[in-house]
Amino acid sequence: ESGYAQNGDLEDAELDDYSFSCYSQLEVNGSQHSLTCAFEDPDVNITNLEFEICGALVEVKCLNFRKLQEIYFIETKKFLLIGKSNICVKVGEKSLTCKKIDLTTIVKPEAPFDLSVVYREGANDFVVTFNTSHLQKKYVKVLMHDVAYRQEKDENKWTHVNLSSTKLTLLQRKLQPAAMYEIKVRSIPDHYFKGFWSEWSPSYYFRTPEINNSSGEMDPI
């Protein structure tokens, strides 16, 4: 419906001139929700194009989007979050293309933050923790997180771990000794609400200890 893939990843859309994608973020600023749309064709001339949403709104029939560089944006408390809204691309009063979208099915969570990794010498493991603003939210509380890590020298060899909590333990023996690792995390709605992966958190970098030859164990840094 939105030009995104079912698995939460973006897909190459079959592009017509005005095909577009949108995502919602609920309670993104206190009790305010946001809706962000953009064209799928990077070459489309957006000069006179506007977006409008109608239906499934509280107290009003329609709302106009604000244009912010090349995205179209609404921040409001007026989303009903029940039923489908009609989102249209317009030039003047003329609608060029429209899509009916349930805003609860295009939710993009906020990116996780405060990612850190602590080495536990006695346990020979690494405890990965991160935070998410969604723990405090009323609506989108339940998320699936995707923790991805790689040895820094391995450009595209990411290992992914899915989890519902904000804490993960990585066993030292599963990692290379004396190596620099990059780790990052993203989130996707996992209960009632549907949608897309958040942006990745900022990456965190950590080094694994050397192997201690006498014991065969790694030395902490």
Partner: nanobody
């Protein structure tokens, strides 16, 4: 102010691969469609590939279709160009910029395809 820093170019044999990176700063990267351009000596700068704001839409010049792939990482404010099956005619200085660019350009990165 806007800064665009391209990297990843080099000398490669025909049929080889390179991955170009462009680190952007000084503007809200995630609000713009981005593109790669190239300029060979004595020629006009040409559009190679473009990617939409969310990354789901991509367009390519006919000469690179099926060989080049543009992608973006909004968390890192970076746009990439994976170039496979390189040909001598791909030799040029490669630049990234907004699809609807301002006057500012980075220094570019030189790609030379030669045996």
């Amino acid at each position: 102010q806007v800064q665009l820093v391209e990297s990843g170019g080099g000398l490669v044999q025909p049929g080889g691969s390179l991955r170009l990176s462009c680190a952007a700063s000084g503007f809200t990267f995630s609000n713009y469609a981005m593109s790669w351009y190239r300029q060979a000596p004595g020629k006009e700068r040409e559009l190679v590939a473009s990617i939409s704001v969310f990354g789901g839409g991509t367009n390519y010049a006919d000469s690179v279709k099926g060989r080049f792939t543009i992608s973006r990482d909004n968390a890192k404010n970076t746009v990439y160009l994976q170039m496979n099956s390189l040909k001598p005619e791909d030799s040029a200085v490669y630049y990234c910029n907004k699809r609807r660019y301002d006057d500012y350009w980075g220094q570019g990165t030189q790609v030379t395809v030669s045996s």
